[in-house]
Amino acid sequence: AGLLLIVSPSHPTEGSPVNLTCKMPSLQSSDAQFQFCFFRDDQALGPGWSSSPKLQIANMWKEDSGSYWCEAQTMASKVLRSWRSQINVHRVPVADVSLETQPPGGQVMEGDRLVLICSVAMGTGDITFLWYKGAIGLNLQTKTQRSLTAEYEIPTARESDAEQYYCVAENGYGPRPSGLVSITVRIPVSRPILMVRAPRAQAVVGDVLKLHCEALRGSHPILYWFYHEDVILGSSSAPSGGGASFNLSLTAEHSGNYSCEANNGLGAQRSEEVTLNFTVPTGARSNHLTS
């Protein structure tokens, strides 16, 4: 009486279940009279000896590939053995690797948490995920796990983290890189510095005074506002750095306190006030400006 091991499916994919059934085609006896045991490469599987002729392996992995058979034992202790069946577990290569960011869009505030999430649309088994910084990649981290996504965390984003990133996934069929993702670290403006430039040491009425306002830190573009005694004189945008300037043609009324404000949409900062005083001399002497 020959035992038959039925494997379903016969060519399983990693991560999927496999059903093993021990059949006795030449015996009509009730299965209840037998104890069954399933083996792989000389090792008993599952519960060992059992009255059930079926065994389900919930998740098959590449390393579960091997030679399987079953045995049946009668009440009289006679042991029947099936032929060996070779089960080869098929690994699905990784495909469609993508890199996403949290927060989405690759824009993060300085000091905030940035997560780079590497995903594969398909792929089974242990997948090795690698994260790289720069188009010529500096390897940041490597993780191996049995999942379709993995995360790399930058707990506190800094200006130096603004770069291109990509990830690579690999499960034995060669590395597969994601596309590039660009990270922008958004930096609130620092307190701007207001500088006053006059054409001469003692400026006179009619001279053009240059007010220059610059925030040394902050993501661009930065919009600068210029104030005289809290009244807006005008504004100027600096798309890429170097601050902004405002030209003022001097009149006697221009004495007083000047300030500027920098705003890049992430918060506004006001400069310290600069006091400009005119002394109005008598006679033919000109009005002079001192600060």
């Epitope: 790289y132 010529i136 990649g137 291109q164 596309g179 590039l180 660009s182």
Partner: antibody, heavy 119, light 112 residues
Framework: QVQLQQSGPELVKPGASVRISCKAS????????IHWVKQRPGQGLEWIGW????????KYNEKFKGKTTLTADKSSSTAYMQLSSLTSEDSAVYFC????????????WGQGTTLTLSS | DVLMTQTPLSLPVSLGDQVSISCRSG???????????LEWYLQKPGQSPKLLIY???NRFSGVPDRFSGSGSGTDFTLRISRVEAEDLGVYYC?????????FGGGTKLEIK
Amino acid sequence: QVQLQQSGPELVKPGASVRISCKASGYTFTSYNIHWVKQRPGQGLEWIGWIYPGDGNTKYNEKFKGKTTLTADKSSSTAYMQLSSLTSEDSAVYFCARRIHYFDYFDYWGQGTTLTLSS
Amino acid sequence: DVLMTQTPLSLPVSLGDQVSISCRSGQTIVHSNGNTYLEWYLQKPGQSPKLLIYKVSNRFSGVPDRFSGSGSGTDFTLRISRVEAEDLGVYYCFQGSHVPWTFGGGTKLEIK
């Protein structure tokens, strides 16, 4: 299949500007950097710089700064290179090329755009 | 800039010959990440360059195994074991380790 289709030959006068285009197809345009390479008649190859179409970020060879401006339009999957204040030194064939990160090589090239200066 | 010097400038060959092209860099082209970004390209007349070898010795897919690359530090070599008619053209080495990236001056492979 991946293709980089460049604009046709240009005949321009010294001092003028010109814009060469490189239209990408067959892949996700924002996933790879586009590089530009110059080849003077009968001479070797010079790397000009690259642009990342995802955000317009650029990296230039210092030699070409001020001469060259690289831009990209995501909606049409097209990269552009503008050359300004043209002189006879700018007469060349210009190539765009896609560079694959991780493996690090230029795997696809445009067919080249010939720029000729004529007074 | 890293100067890439190719020798010889011209290489007259007979079909079936084994040939070597040398490329020397003015400084080491090992990147700070440990990789050496040295590539070889072949350009035929009127065409754009085509990749042969990347990272010193890796053959690009579809490139015949008669092409091989070797070297380290500053000295690199491209070998063709048996030259075929389709191999004729100008060969360029390229370094992508240090900005600005630079090409060698080229080696013209031609029939004797």
